[in-house]
Interface confidence: low
């Protein structure tokens, strides 16, 4: 018996071939011997089956001795053995219809779980193998779960259903709702304007929700809310903002925040959360601010950084075009009685300069000038 696999909602064509290459009488019946369709001369006749309005054939093929049964908009309950009667012969075809759906919305937040459920006819024992867009192979039975979705799981999931050495392939588009970056770090000299950007890793027609930026300053004992905002059809409106610092926010996506000036008391870590309408859970992006200050007080030239720096970062003080006078894995370095000239304070990671601040040391009879 021939086995054909079909997909729920699709169209299937079951073949039936006569040895004579001409139009002769044929009938398609189901396992209960109820006539589905057949012919009377060159006319298509239909029986009383449930498939009535969804069953068809191709008259153009009858003259070649081919009498297909076409079933449109397949349903799981169409799974059955179909019998073609032609030339005193009976050809049996077993049709198995499967459906695969994401049993939740196909737009899921990063970290959430995706469950794919297979609808299958009674008596079948299919196996399912799905491949995520990042090439991850997942196998399962009637249900298949993937926990902790990552950004790389966005895209088309290709699932193969195997039954009786036959296979049928499903494609499901999954959108993982997340920020493009889980974390970012901004390095600024004291007094500079700070730009924070929070680009989303997905695009949807309408985006509505609300968000908030909580900030934990390095010098503060507790975190505080710097800004809250609403998002309506990709338009941003600020609800509440602290007076210190007074952040400004862009009115359109991507989410964009401006801190008028970088000050040591603002250095620290922030967490931007975005709650989307009709979604449980929130999107998160961490943002870090490192602030540098170079000062000269009396005979002491000091360079300091505030904020979440890695222990491997190097802080150096050097006179322009000369070797570093002092270089330490510390958050503050200083030089006593510095020579006159342009001094550079450098924060670097494996030789790559992340932040630089220059300070001019004048002869001892002058006062310092900070560019």
């Amino acid at each position: 018996k021939k086995v054909v696999l079909g997909k729920k909602g699709d169209t299937v064509e079951l073949t039936c071939t006569a040895s004579q290459k001409k139009s002769i009488q044929f009938h398609w019946k189901n396992s209960n011997q109820i006539k589905i369709l057949g012919n009377q001369g060159s006319f298509l006749t239909k029986g009383p089956s449930k498939l009535n309005d969804r069953a068809d054939s191709r008259r153009s093929l009858w003259d070649q001795g081919n009498f297909p049964l076409i079933i449109k908009n397949l349903k799981i309950e169409d799974s059955d053995t179909y019998i073609c009667e032609v030339e005193d012969q009976k050809e049996e075809v077993q049709l198995l219809v499967f459906g695969l759906t994401a049993n939740s919305d196909t737009h899921l937040l990063q970290g959430q779980s995706l469950t794919l459920t297979l609808e299958s006819p009674p008596g079948s024992s299919p196996s399912v193998q799905c491949r995520s867009p990042r090439g991850k192979n997942i196998q399962g039975g009637k249900t298949l779960s993937v926990s902790q979705l990552e950004l790389q799981d966005s895209g088309t999931w290709t699932c193969t259903v195997l039954q009786n050495q036959k296979k049928v392939e499903f494609k499901i588009d999954i959108v993982v709702l997340a920020f493009q970056k889980a974390s970012s770090i901004v390095y600024k000299k004291e007094g500079e304007q700070v730009e924070f950007s929070f680009p989303l890793a997905f695009t949807v027609e309408k985006l509505t929700g609300s968000g908030e930026l909580w900030w934990q300053a390095e010098r503060a004992s507790s975190s505080k809310s710097w800004i809250t905002f609403d998002l309506k059809n990709k338009e941003v409106s600020v609800k509440r903002v602290t007076q210190d610092p007074k952040l400004q926010m862009g009115k359109k996506l991507p989410l964009h925040l401006t801190l008028p000036q970088a000050l040591p008391q603002y250095a620290g870590s922030g967490n931007l959360t975005l709650a989307l309408e009709a979604k449980t859970g929130k999107l998160h992006q961490e943002v870090n601010l490192v602030v540098m200050r170079a000062t000269q007080l009396q005979k002491n030239l000091t360079c300091e950084v505030w904020g979440p720096t890695s222990p491997k970062l190097m802080l150096s003080l050097k006179l322009e075009n000369k070797e570093a006078k002092v270089s330490k894995r510390e958050k503050a370095v200083w030089v006593l009685n510095p020579e006159a000239g342009m001094w550079q304070c450098l924060l670097s990671d494996s030789g790559q300069v992340l932040l630089e601040s220059n300070i001019k040391v004048l002869p001892t009879w002058s006062t310092p000038v900070q560019p």
Epitope: K136, N137, S147
Partner: antibody, heavy 118, light 108 residues
Framework: EVQVVESGGGLVQPGGSLRLSCAAS????????MHWVRQATGKGLEWVST???????YYPGSVKGRFTISRENAKNSLYLQMNSLRAGDTAVYYC????????????WGQGTTVTVSS | EIVLTQSPGTLSLSPGERATLSCRAS???????LAWYQQKPGQSPRLLIH???SRATGIPDRVSGSGSGTDFTLTISRLEPEDFAVYYC?????????FGPGTKVDIK
């Protein structure tokens, strides 16, 4: 430095049990598939088990029902519980990390030796 | 089970020569799921190629992979002394994720 280090190998009698451990460091352990692969002296590589990030587990027929792979993400640790051991299980057992964006074992340990003998 | 067959079993070549190693699968394997490894005596295996043709980090461009379906090839354009080793292919198309028996490349 990204690395995996196996431990727990040793001499065990046929029918006995052994638990291998693999300590991972230098990467976000929970985000990667992890594998056990073995190699008998002078022979080729044989895949033993895989655990996915979702906790999904895979085994070849030769060890199915006898070996159990598990992971403890909080401890950055991978385990292989081996029961009903046979002489044919004697080998060097390697722990390996699966690629993040692709299929392939991109980080391997030095291996731990398991000897099943009476 | 997908069975991988590697040929030849041993390849005897001189430094500077081109090495062509074959890996044949008993049934079709998506190229995304084929990897190649190198193993030297007393050492752990090392990933060379993933996705049939993508070089792993740090692998020189004299090493390349190709193929699709059931036939895959690993090519080393000019053999260097450090390339003499055993090479294995592995498939992830379906569980069990089998390895080939290996091809030994030794000095002529």
């Amino acid at each position: 430095e990204v690395q995996v280090v196996e431990s727990g190998g040793g001499l065990v009698q046929p029918g006995g049990s052994l638990r291998l451990s693999c300590a991972a460091s230098g990467f976000t352990f929970s985000s990667y598939d992890m594998h056990w692969v073995r190699q008998a002296t002078g022979k080729g590589l044989e895949w033993v088990s895989t655990i996915g990030t979702a906790g999904d587990t895979y085994y070849p027929g030769s060890v199915k029902g006898r070996f159990t792979i598990s992971r403890e993400n909080a401890k950055n640790s991978l385990y292989l519980q081996m029961n009903s051991l046979r002489a044919g299980d004697t080998a060097v057992y390697y722990c390996a990390r699966g690629g993040y964006y692709y299929y392939g074992m991109d980080v391997w340990g030095q291996g731990t030796t398991v000897t099943v003998s009476s | 089970e997908i069975v991988l067959t590697q040929s030849p079993g041993t390849l005897s070549l001189s430094p500077g020569e081109r090495a062509t190693l074959s890996c044949r699968a008993s049934q079709s394997v998506s190229s995304s799921y084929l990897a190649w490894y190198q193993q030297k005596p007393g050492q752990s295996p090392r990933l060379l190629i993933h996705g049939a043709s993508s070089r792993a980090t740090g692998i020189p461009d004299r090493v390349s992979g190709s193929g699709s379906g059931t036939d895959f090839t690993l090519t080393i354009s000019r053999l260097e002394p450090e390339d003499f080793a055993v090479y294995y292919c592995q498939q992830y198309g379906s569980s069990p994720f089998t390895f080939g028996p290996g091809t030994k490349v030794d000095i002529k």
